[in-house]
Interface confidence: medium
Amino acid sequence: RKIPKVGHTFFQKPESCPPVPGGSMKLDIGIINENQRVSMSRNIESRSTSPWNYTVTWDPNRYPSEVVQAQCRNLGCINAQGKEDISMNSVPIQQETLVVRRKHQGCSVSFQLEKVLVTVGCTCVTPVIHHVQ
Amino acid sequence: GITIPRNPGCPNSEDKNFPRTVMVNLNIHNRNTNTNPKRSSDYYNRSTSPWNLHRNEDPERYPSVIWEAKCRHLGCINADGNVDYHMNSVPIQQEILVLRREPPHCPNSFRLEKILVSVGCTCVTPIVHHVA
C-alpha cells in the first residue's frame, strides 16, 4: 500500500530526519505561535450588513478543544434603514483548518489529524438569478 | 500508543523523558475536501465587500497552499455598483492550525503551527468617533 505524501512536493530525505514508522508522521505538539491573537475590527459580527452569531463547540479530545462556528442571522442583508433586504443574500465564509483528535484507552493514546471546515463569518452577496425557460 | 498521565502510574509532562512528540496516522480525515476557494464559490466577486485571493505557497507547510483574502476597496459596493465610502469593507480573520516540516525538508516530521489568515471580507457600518 502506498503511503500518501503530505503536501505535493517531493523531498530528498536529509540524513538528519528522524526515523518514522511506515504509515505515520512524527508530530511535535509544542505549538509555534501558540499565543497569537486575532485582531479583527471590533464587533464586526454585529456591525456587518450580513451579521452573524457565534457558537462554540467543545471537545476535550480534540486540539484545539474549542472550535467557534459562525451562523448568518438572516437570509437577506441589512440595509441602511436597519431592515432586512431579501433581494440580497447573507452567505457563510468558510475556512479549512487542521485539528488533532485524541483517542484513549486507559493510559494508551493514539492521535489522528483531521480537516474541519469552520464558518468564520458572513458576507452580503448579489444573488445568482436562474431564469426558467 | 504513547502514555497519558492519568494517575501516579503515568508519567508527568515535566519529566525529561515525557514525550513532546507523538506519532500520528498519515491518513488525514477529510483530507480531500476542496481547498480552492475560487473553485468552491464566487462570493469573492459577488460580495458587496469583494476581495481578491492571493495564493500563499510554502512547501515546508501542510497544506502547502493557503489562499489569503485582500479587500478590494475601503468602502462597499452599493446597488448602483459604485463604492460607498459611508460603509467599510473589512477582512474576516481566522486562526488555523497547519503543519510545519521540522526539521526542514523532512517528509514525515512536523510541528503544529498557528497562523492567521484573512478568509474573506464583510461590509460593516463604520465606528464614528465624534471629536468634542
Epitope: I29, G30, I31, Y63, P64, V100, R102, V109, F111 | I4, P5, R6, N12, S13, E14, R20, L112
Partner: nanobody, 119 residues
Framework: EVQLVESGGGLVQPGGSLRLSCAAS????????MYWVRQAPGKGLEWVAE????????YYVDSVKGRFTISRDNAKNSLYLQMNSLRAEDTAVYYC????????????WGQGTLVTVSS
C-alpha cells in the same frame, strides 16, 4: 511539588447532591485551565467539565449539562464541582486535573474521590 487533593465524594441517593473540592498547590493555579474527569468502574476516562483560568468560561459534557457546575476560587487555589440531581450513571472516581502545558495532555492529576450514587 505540584499537588491536587480531591475531597467531598461519598455515597448519595439518586436525585441527591454533592460538592467536590480540589485543593491545588505547587503551581500558579490562576494561570491554568482546570478540569474534572471521571472514571466509572470498568470504563474509560470521561472529561466532565473544564473551567478557564479566570473562571469566565466553563464547558460540560452533554450528560451533565444543567446538573453539574464547575467553579474555582483563585484566591484559595481551589476547584469545585457542584453535582445536583445525581444519577446512578454518575457513579465514578472523580479526578481534578491541571490544565495542559502541552496540547492534549493533562500533566498532573489528583488521587481521585469516589462518588457512589445508589439507593
Amino acid at each position: 511539588e505540584v499537588q491536587l487533593v480531591e475531597s467531598g465524594g461519598g455515597l448519595v441517593q439518586p436525585g441527591g447532591s454533592l460538592r467536590l473540592s480540589c485543593a491545588a498547590s505547587g503551581f500558579t493555579f490562576s494561570s491554568y485551565s482546570m478540569y474534572w474527569v471521571r472514571q466509572a468502574p470498568g470504563k474509560g476516562l470521561e472529561w466532565v467539565a473544564e473551567i478557564k483560568q479566570d473562571g469566565s468560561v466553563q464547558y460540560y459534557v452533554d450528560s451533565v449539562k444543567g446538573r453539574f457546575t464547575i467553579s474555582r476560587d483563585n484566591a484559595k487555589n481551589s476547584l469545585y464541582l457542584q453535582m445536583n440531581s445525581l444519577r446512578a450513571e454518575d457513579t465514578a472516581v472523580y479526578y481534578c486535573a491541571k490544565g495542559e502545558i502541552l496540547p492534549l495532555y493533562f500533566d498532573y492529576w489528583g488521587q481521585g474521590t469516589l462518588v457512589t450514587v445508589s439507593s
